[in-house]
């Protein structure tokens, strides 16, 4: 399975709120002994490669903003830590899952990882990770709302 | 905090089967590999198996034949029992939580269990 | 199985001297390896995950580095409260192995 990440900028203006996104892409094995693990973190363009850093965001680190179940279900982080730090992490059915970031300041811009672990029970984890860049922006020059630019291209989209 | 704390008797006599449970405590048992970890007196340390939060389990197969590692989620607890014991298998034994994609990042204070007759 | 082999067996430093542990993979296991400090009769602590992240609340004189098959834990300035055995461990696949130990010992 691979990670995709729909939009790797996003620009937004200072107190907005942002939904960053990742997707799982098949084929995605949904055995009893697959389990999967998900979380998000900042990170820096690496040591070693892309996402291989791990900082916290807003002070939550992984382990604090991680998401687990099966390969059916959909799963949230409800907890008060995270909403208490304005931030809450989710994942559907459909192999997509999101952090969302309020009340957006200048601290928050950076990279962003999201991790995905694959665990085949009896033979080993599979991580694979998706990487997006937010820019956070203030004063005249700064969107009146986000701004996403996909992966694939430089086209940009206005998220209202 | 989550805490964890190994218990079970010290003393197993050989052939016998030796009992051990950790209990979890301050947090979610979910999300996590629960392992068994052991330490030989003046030796290092030796992955014995795990049980994820799932059910699932994953046995080092230098033991699995004798390995087996339950979960009981409703009493935050796991429990490892290991069969046939000979005193090859005097350690301290440790209950470690396992982060995916990560480490043993809490581990209890460990237990002494010593075999003999 | 992968075997890792950790050198020195002992190191007998002084406080404040620079302290760097090596730790052999027997194949490569990418970056994921951790680093734990042990104290008689004490549980190991987790140091250093995926080669060069500091676990929470380890201070910053503990770096690790490395890839593939050769890897190193640094303590920059060593405090007394660091004199203990060290290990190694990979999570690249299972079993999970540690290392043998390198022992930090005052000289």
């Known amino acids: 399975f691979k990670v995709a990440t729909p939009y790797s900028l996003y620009v937004c203006p200072e107190g907005q709120q942002v939904t960053l996104t990742c997707r799982l892409l098949g084929p995605v094995d949904k055995g009893h002994d697959v389990t999967f693990y998900k979380t998000w973190y900042r990170s820096s363009r690496g040591e070693v490669q892309t996402c291989s850093e791990r900082r916290p965001i807003r002070q939550l680190t992984f382990q604090d903003l991680h998401l687990h179940h099966g390969g059916h279900q959909a799963a949230q982080t409800s907890h008060d830590l995270a909403q208490r730090h304005g931030l809450e992490s989710a994942s559907d059915h459909h192999g997509q899952f999101s952090i969302t970031m309020r009340n957006l300041t200048l601290l928050d811009s950076g990279l962003y990882c999201c991790l995905v672990v694959e665990i085949r029970h009896h033979h080993s984890e599979h991580r694979v990770h998706g990487a997006m860049e937010l820019q956070v922006q203030t004063g005249k020059d700064a969107p009146s709302n986000c701004v996403v630019y996909p992966s694939s291209s430089q086209d940009s989209e206005q998220i209202t | 905090q989550v805490q964890l704390q190994e218990s079970g008797p010290g003393l197993v006599k050989p052939s016998e089967t030796l009992s051990l449970t950790c209990t979890v405590s301050g947090g979610s048992i979910s999300s996590y590999y629960w392992s068994w970890i052991r330490q030989p007196p003046g030796k290092g340390l030796e992955w014995i198996g795990y049980?994820?939060?799932?059910?699932?389990?994953n046995y080092n197969p230098s033991l699995k034949s004798r390995v087996t590692i339950s979960v009981d989620t409703s009493k935050s607890q796991f429990s490892l029992k290991l069969s046939s014991v000979t005193a090859a298998d005097t350690a301290v034994y440790y209950c470690a939580r396992d982060i995916p994609a990560s480490a043993f990042d809490i581990w209890g204070q460990g237990t002494m269990v010593i075999v003999s007759s | 199985e992968i075997v890792l082999t950790q050198s020195p067996a002992t190191l007998s430093l002084s406080p404040g001297e620079r302290a760097t542990l090596s730790c052999r993979a027997s194949q490569s296991v990418s970056y994921y390896l951790a680093w734990y400090q042990q104290k008689p009769g004490q549980a190991p602590r987790l140091l250093i995950y995926?080669?060069?992240n500091r676990a929470t609340g380890i201070p910053a004189r503990f770096s690790g580095s490395g890839s593939g098959t050769d890897f190193t834990l640094t303590i920059s300035s060593l405090e007394p409260e660091d004199f203990a055995v060290y290990y190694c461990q990979q999570r690249i696949n299972w079993p999970l192995t540690f290392g043998g130990g390198t022992k930090v010992e005052i000289k």
């Open positions: 049980i994820y939060y799932s059910g699932s389990t």
């Open positions: 995926d080669a060069f």
